[in-house]
Amino acid sequence: MMTGTIETTGNISAEKGGSIILQCHLSSTTAQVTQVNWEQQDQLLAICNADLGWHISPSFKDRVAPGPGLGLTLQSLTVNDTGEYFCIYHTYPDGTYTGRIFLEVLESSVAEHGARFQIP
């Protein structure tokens, strides 16, 4: 039975040209995290594998940095980066847990972080 929950940074906003950290955390389970995939809508951004380490998709290499931890740092943000991001935790023996983050990239300096929330 899957007992874990994913906590994410929730709905966040950031300024155009700036950077942002996408962070997820899996709790309430003893399952082993074997891999975390980061996706932006229908694009694979990066993978962090427990044995192989990080793989950043070549088309995002200039603007995506691994970490901190299992998180992902997006740099040189553009308005086109606005949208949904998913952290997909592959675990053993539980299976797959998915967290969702919505990022809004703003032109002005009114960006602020939203509250944390949980996805079961």
Partner: antibody
């Protein structure tokens, strides 16, 4: 240099058994998931089975479930496919392939031919 | 199971031609789509992974695009060594599935 070398293929009668091996070298075998993929004569590619790096998770195509068993011995850097209750439609070249990040198959063996016929 | 439909099943082209092969998934697979080249009597060779990433050592005339359900493999200028069969494969979920293949022949 990454190398995958299959062996164990041959001619077997319907209902018989065969065990394929895939000897891996040139990389840290236990860090990678591995798959078996087959190709019937003149046909396309068909995924058969996969196993995680630790061997804790295994996956099968419906066509072989209950008849084939995938396993690995990380101390010997070897992948196995135990094939029981073989049928004529299992006749194919069987390839082992390395699967980094469980997303793509970047290295393949040369294949071993399994022929099921009476 | 996710069905992968490749088209065309075969095509004839000349050296220097631009060739496009398409692959459609029966449901969204994000960008978990790979392309392989296979020559007669040989093992498949990875060309493109995760829809658009060029595998190391593969010539830049090969490119991949698409996401969701529709994907494309393009060979910008066909070379003599490119005459082969090409397969797409989804790795979004098990069972992993391949397209039926596209045979690229000399015109």
């Amino acid at each position: 240099e990454v190398q995958l070398l299959e062996s164990g293929g041959g001619l077997v009668q319907p209902g018989g058994s065969l065990r394929l091996s895939c000897a891996a070298s040139g990389f840290t075998f236990s860090s990678y998931s591995m798959s078996w993929v087959r190709q019937a004569p003149g046909k396309g590619l068909e995924w058969v089975s996969a196993i995680s790096g630790s061997g804790g998770s295994t996956y099968y195509a419906d066509s072989v479930k209950g008849r084939f068993t995938i396993s690995r011995d990380n101390s010997k850097n070897t992948l196995y496919l135990q094939m029981n209750s073989l049928r004529a439609e299992d006749t194919a070249v069987y390839y082992c392939a390395r699967e980094p990040y469980d997303v793509w198959m970047d290295y393949w063996g040369q294949g071993t031919l399994v022929t099921v016929s009476s | 199971d996710i069905q992968m439909t490749q088209s065309p099943s075969s095509l004839s082209a000349s050296v220097g031609d631009r060739v496009t092969i398409t692959c459609r998934a029966s449901q969204s697979i994000s960008s978990y789509l790979n392309w392989y080249q296979q020559k007669p009597g040989k093992a498949p060779k990875l060309l493109i992974y995760a829809a658009s990433s060029l595998q190391s050592g593969v010539p830049s005339r090969f490119s991949g695009s698409g996401s969701g359900t529709d994907f494309t493999l393009t060979i910008s200028s066909l070379q003599p060594e490119d005459f082969a069969t090409y397969y797409c494969q989804q790795s979004y979920s098990t069972p992993l599935t391949f397209g039926g293949g596209t045979k690229v022949e000399i015109k």
